[in-house]
């Protein structure tokens, strides 16, 4: 049989067929974060578990030093959830003191770094004001979308405040990507 | 033509090619929940609509008795949204009474059950403190990620309080999975 | 080699194999919205950037006049995030004034329109009461799920209040779909 017979009749096969099980994929899970230096105006990056428990990397998708390395150009679905938890936000304390009640916030950014380009690209951002009444609060921010990435691109997850990230359970805070 | 010509030149075809339309897939939608017994420390599982409206199961992915049955080993993207709604949480009542204001919470867990292993595995958790000022509140929790599953695994969605789940619309509360 | 050797032995290849890079895909990003007329009881639709920055459409998936056009029948993963921001909701003002504290809300709906039928079908809804204490609030609603779509179907994103949508950054508010 000619290969053409596998393809829908209305189109040319202009990209190679490939086995789905061979595509680059990763699901990373949270670990306790070690305080690290970061630039004043740049959110710190999380580091991740890549092989224990539910975490894995496969088919040349590698994790190193807070980055997921993209081994092959193509369209990827990228996702992350970060669960934050804290004590009463300053917002309500400020409010009680009669000062202007600017809310605190929590933010997650999925960032792409390309070696040939100095400035990181923000792919996805989830940001939320936190102005809780209760003394202890917790909540997740979930992000996910599709992006065209190039071989050699690096992905990371940045957060507004690393000390608020819930690192207690692998199902609460995670980061993943897979080639479509 | 040799089959090799369908594969990218840099790799071996070590998994079979397969038609995408043939992959196990399911999207389940909410139904009114019937109160059921559940263990004291275990969140109750939701049951689902699997064939009316927007719901479907296909290609040997079956739904039975609150579980999605995984028919084939591989990497699956699994997702769920649960919309919760309720009256003012106890948190604000407690606060008004001057007692320590421990917040209420809402939680969704996507759980994997493997027959050969007694303990369920929590794959994804979304949990949020609820300390609302308004008398009626409502909000969704969304989860989604990729996991390596084995043939015979079963997936379910558990919630912290089944009575708070909004079952009024199929687009508000749902659960799905598809083989990548 | 016979084509059959590419397929798992337990199944017939009843759908054509096709190159993944050839599948319809789109990721649209937010632009400043121009006020438009909409029916009283229908949420307004957002319009989108489809080719600048992170936005793209490919493989016959086209964007036109607020709609993503589905070029081919099949199962699609559809997603959107809308970030809302506003001043203190009326809810807390009402509360201070001692009137019944009905919460405001923010809602995102992903809607399918079929030419042969005037009534849209709501595929996904994320809805949240907003009853914030702080003077400025902001938060995202994320949605994503899989649906069977027909060639010619059109997708749009509707929101409860277009003036609350954060259009300042392409990573905060977006809409996408891809054929599985």
């Amino acid at each position: 049989l000619k290969g053409q017979e596998f393809a829908p009749s209305h189109q040319q096969v202009y990209a190679p067929l490939r086995a789905d099980g061979d595509k680059p994929r990763a699901h990373l899970t949270v670990v306790r974060q070690t305080p690290t230096q970061h630039f004043k105006n740049q959110f710190p990056a999380l580091h991740w578990e890549h092989e224990l428990g539910l975490a894995f990397t496969k088919n040349r998708m590698n994790y190193t030093n807070k980055f997921l390395l993209i081994p092959e150009s193509g369209d990827y679905f990228i996702y992350s959830q970060v669960t934050f938890r804290g004590m009463t936000s300053e917002c309500s304390e400020i409010r009680q003191a009669g000062r202007p009640n600017k809310p605190d916030s929590i933010t997650v950014v999925i960032t792409k770094v390309t070696d040939s380009y100095p400035e990181p690209t923000q792919l996805l951002m989830g940001t939320k004001s936190v102005c809780e009444v209760g003394s202890n609060w917790f909540q997740p921010i979930y992000l996910g979308a599709m992006f065209s990435l190039q071989e050699g691109d690096k992905l990371m997850v940045n957060v507004s405040d690393i000390s608020l990230v819930d690192y207690t359970k692998e199902d609460k805070t995670f980061f993943g990507a897979f080639l479509l | 033509l040799k089959g090799q010509e369908f594969a990218p030149s840099h790799q071996q075809v070590y998994a079979p090619l397969r038609a995408d339309g043939d992959k196990p897939r399911a999207h389940l939608t909410v139904v009114r929940q019937t109160p059921t017994q559940h263990f004291k420390n275990q969140f109750p599982a939701l049951h689902w609509e699997h064939e009316l409206g927007l719901a479907f199961t296909k290609n040997r992915m079956n739904y039975t008795n609150k579980f999605l049955l995984i028919p084939e080993s591989g990497d699956y993207f699994i997702y769920s949204q649960v919309t919760f709604r309720g009256m003012t949480s106890e948190c604000s009542e407690i606060r008004q009474a001057g007692r320590p204001n421990k917040p209420d919470s809402i939680t969704v867990v996507i759980t994997k059950v493997t027959d050969s292993y007694p303990e369920p595995t929590q794959l994804l958790m979304g949990t949020k403190s609820v300390c609302e000022v308004g008398s009626n509140w409502f909000q969704p929790i969304y989860l989604g990620a990729m996991f390596s599953l084995q043939e015979g695994d079963k997936l379910m969605v558990n919630v912290s309080d089944i009575s708070l789940v909004d079952y009024t619309k199929e687009d508000k509360t749902f659960f799905g999975a598809f083989l990548l | 080699l016979k084509g059959q050797e590419f397929a798992p032995s337990h199944q017939q290849v009843y759908a054509p194999l096709r190159a993944d890079g050839d599948k319809p895909r789109a990721h649209l990003t937010v632009v400043r919205q121009t006020p438009t007329q909409h029916f009283k009881n229908q949420f307004p639709a957002l319009h989108w950037e489809h080719e600048l920055g992170l936005a793209f459409t490919k493989n016959r998936m086209n964007y036109t006049n607020k709609f993503l056009l589905i070029p081919e029948s099949g199962d699609y993963f559809i997603y959107s995030q809308v970030t809302f921001r506003g001043m203190t909701s009326e809810c807390s003002e009402i509360r201070q004034a001692g009137r019944p504290n009905k919460p405001d809300s923010i809602t995102v709906v992903i809607t399918k329109v079929t030419d042969s039928y005037p009534e849209p079908t709501q595929l996904l809804m994320g809805t949240k009461s907003v009853c914030e204490v702080g003077s400025n609030w902001f938060q995202p609603i994320y949605l994503g799920a899989m649906f069977s779509l027909q060639e010619g179907d059109k997708l749009m994103v509707n929101v409860s209040d277009i003036s609350l949508v954060d259009y300042t950054k392409e990573d905060k508010t977006f809409f996408g779909a891809f054929l599985l």
Epitope: - | R32, L54, T168, E170 | T121
Partner: antibody, heavy 124, light 107 residues
Framework: QVQLVQSGAEVKKPGASVKVSCKAS????????ISWVRQAPGQGLEWMGW????????HYAQKLQGRVTMTTDTSTRTAYMELRSLRSDDTAVYYC?????????????????WGQGTTVTVSS | EIVLTQSPATLSLSPGERATLSCRAS??????LAWYQQKPGQAPRLLIY???NRATGIPARFSGSGSGTDFTLTISSLEPEDFAVYYC?????????FGQGTKVEIK
Amino acid sequence: QVQLVQSGAEVKKPGASVKVSCKASGYDFTYYGISWVRQAPGQGLEWMGWISPYNGNTHYAQKLQGRVTMTTDTSTRTAYMELRSLRSDDTAVYYCARENYYGSGAYRGGMDVWGQGTTVTVSS
Amino acid sequence: EIVLTQSPATLSLSPGERATLSCRASQSVSSYLAWYQQKPGQAPRLLIYDASNRATGIPARFSGSGSGTDFTLTISSLEPEDFAVYYCQQRSSWPWTFGQGTKVEIK
């Protein structure tokens, strides 16, 4: 407006097959299931089966299992019911009906739109 | 399969009278029960869905009640056009099934 239009009357010999069509208009065909119901002369309604144009799922009445096949063509918005190995007691008016579903976990709806009926006569 | 039993088989009443039709299921169908009206030579018409919800365009004199195994269709004051055969149908589990029908005839 919402309507279902069925194919015309059929006269068949025992052992033959019949295929009745039901063309939908005025609504999103893929979203709502289609049931087929028959009514023998002077008898009550008998539910034959259901198909979802959205996902292809089918359910058939036990007594017709193996003899009936329901299909849909979403491109022409048409549902089909084929009954094989016809017998004289299959003589009936055959109806297609839209299964309304309100998109709510609280409701199952009902058959809210019916075709005009197709008379099938099985006689040697 | 779930068996639905309707009673009475025939109900003879005059216009203006109240009609009460019963439908009993062999096992619980929750509230997933519909009622249909059929006149000679016509297709059936949906009256009530989910036990108690009137379908679009159905007059207020038609009402449904019940849940579990016992259901009632009530016509508060019979109009001449209401004389017909009424069927209940369960939609709780496959296969859907109909009752055998109740004929409401003019006395």
